[in-house]
């Protein structure tokens, strides 16, 4: 029951996390323009992974996508890649985990198969969460670097004078969404991995013991062997116990489905 709850909760947490990673990736507010020391206070600028937007106090918003001719920094491309990899891995993980859920029966799927699928999806969620956290952190580092490097200057450009106004970009809402979402996906993945341990059937290699009916010497056989059917070769009427006798370290183990007298 606890295993099912852990697996189910892990799935739900990861689902919320991946939805958050998708939302963060699509959001425009990765960086917001700090209007301190800016003469155009009626206008607010924010930039995302895909486009830059200008919003006015009147409510008017205009967004423009980034074009390759602008020479986008490699770091931005890296962040895009990390977020997309995170989404893809998370989506595959979700698909795998649906079939791995203990509460869902698909044909005669073995518990061992479900355990493997749970572990696989768990690892995928962990990597997905780490990708998102890494992507958001790289972008945050870019902002911090940009914040301290921004300066005001003046120069003559094509067609006239050009002034650079000191505009600083600060953390946008998408960064916090990304961090939280990545963390949730990571937690969900860990929960799936924990659930996997409970799902996996414990394989026990019992030391079989053969007893003579006459009560003479007991022959201990070090390895497990096939239980006799009671016909054919077992002519001396030996009682065969597959795991009938157990060593001390095996007392805690669960009985095998082959245990019989």
């Amino acid at each position: 029951m606890a295993v099912t709850a852990c697996q189910g909760l892990g799935f739900v947490v990861s689902l919320i996390g991946i939805a958050g990673i998708i939302a963060a990736t699509c959001m425009d507010q990765w960086s917001t323009q700090d209007l301190y020391n800016n003469p155009v206070t009626a206008v607010f600028n924010y930039q995302g992974l895909w486009r830059s937007c200008v919003r006015e106090s009147s409510g008017f918003t205009e967004c423009r996508g980034y074009f390759t001719l602008l020479g986008l920094p490699a770091m931005l491309q890296a962040v895009r890649a990390l977020m997309i990899v995170g989404i893809v891995l998370g989506a595959i993980g979700l698909l795998v985990s649906i079939f791995a859920l203990k509460c869902i029966r698909i044909g005669s799927m073995e518990d061992s198969a479900k355990a493997n699928m749970t572990l696989t999806s768990g690892i995928m969620f962990i990597v997905s969460g780490l990708c998102a956290i890494a992507g958001v952190s790289v972008f945050a580092n870019m902002l911090v670097t940009n914040f301290w490097m921004s300066t005001a200057n003046m120069y003559t450009g094509m067609g006239g004078m050009v002034q650079t106004v000191q505009t600083r970009y600060t953390f946008g809402a998408a960064l916090f969404v990304g961090w939280v979402a990545g963390g949730l996906t990571l937690i969900g993945g860990v929960m799936m991995c924990i659930a996997c341990r409970g799902l996996a059937p414990e394989e026990t290699n019992y030391k079989a013991v053969s007893y003579h009916a006459s009560g003479h010497s007991v022959a201990y056989k070090p390895g497990g062997f096939k239980a006799s059917t009671g016909f054919g070769s077992n002519t001396k009427n030996k009682k065969i116990y597959d795991g009938g006798a157990r060593t001390e370290d095996e007392v805690q183990s669960y009985p095998s489905k082959h245990d019989y007298v």
Epitope: S31, Q33, N38, V40, A42, V43, N45, Q47, S52, C53, V54, E56, S57, S58, G59, F60, E62, R64, Y66, F67, L69, L70, G71, L72, P73, L76, M142, L143, N146, S150, A152, G157, M158, G159, G160, M161, V162, Q163, T164, V165, Q166, T167, Y169
Partner: nanobody
Framework: QVKLEESGGGLVQAGGSLRLSCAVS????????MGWYRQAPGKQRELVAT???????NYSDSVKGRFTISRDNAKNTVYLQMNSLKPEDTAVYYC???????????????WGQGAQVTVSS
């Protein structure tokens, strides 16, 4: 590189009209505001009118009611319709655009080369 190109300047009689236009070309992300400033001989450059992309306009008291600023967002062009011109409107009219050039880049204020407007009495 961003370029501002003005056109429409010239000589006009007092009471006459003139229309200035300014087109922004080049590679940039966003135009924040566009406007017109003027500089009469021996004087400081002063604001005439500005407009945001959303249509919020601002005029100097000396031109209110006579000048009209308008824009074409699709063409990245700003216009200044000047009516009831006076000799004191004689100046070099400069086009201005506040631009965000690229990703995480600082706001840049671009100026045109200027268009001469002369109002004769």
């Amino acid at each position: 590189q961003v370029k501002l190109e003005e056109s429409g300047g010239g000589l006009v009689q007092a009471g006459g009209s003139l229309r200035l236009s300014c087109a922004v070309s080049g590679n940039f992300l966003n135009i924040v505001t566009m406007g017109w400033y003027r500089q009469a001989p021996g004087k400081q450059r002063e604001l005439v009118a500005t407009t945001t992309r959303g249509g919020t306009t601002n005029y100097s008291d000396s031109v209110k009611g006579r000048f009209t600023i308008s824009r074409d967002n699709a063409k990245n062009t700003v216009y200044l319709q000047m009516n009831s011109l006076k000799p004191e409107d004689t100046a070099v009219y400069y086009c201005n655009a506040d631009i965000i050039p690229g990703f995480l880049q600082q706001l840049t204020v671009h100026w045109g080369q200027g268009a001469q407007v002369t109002v004769s009495s």
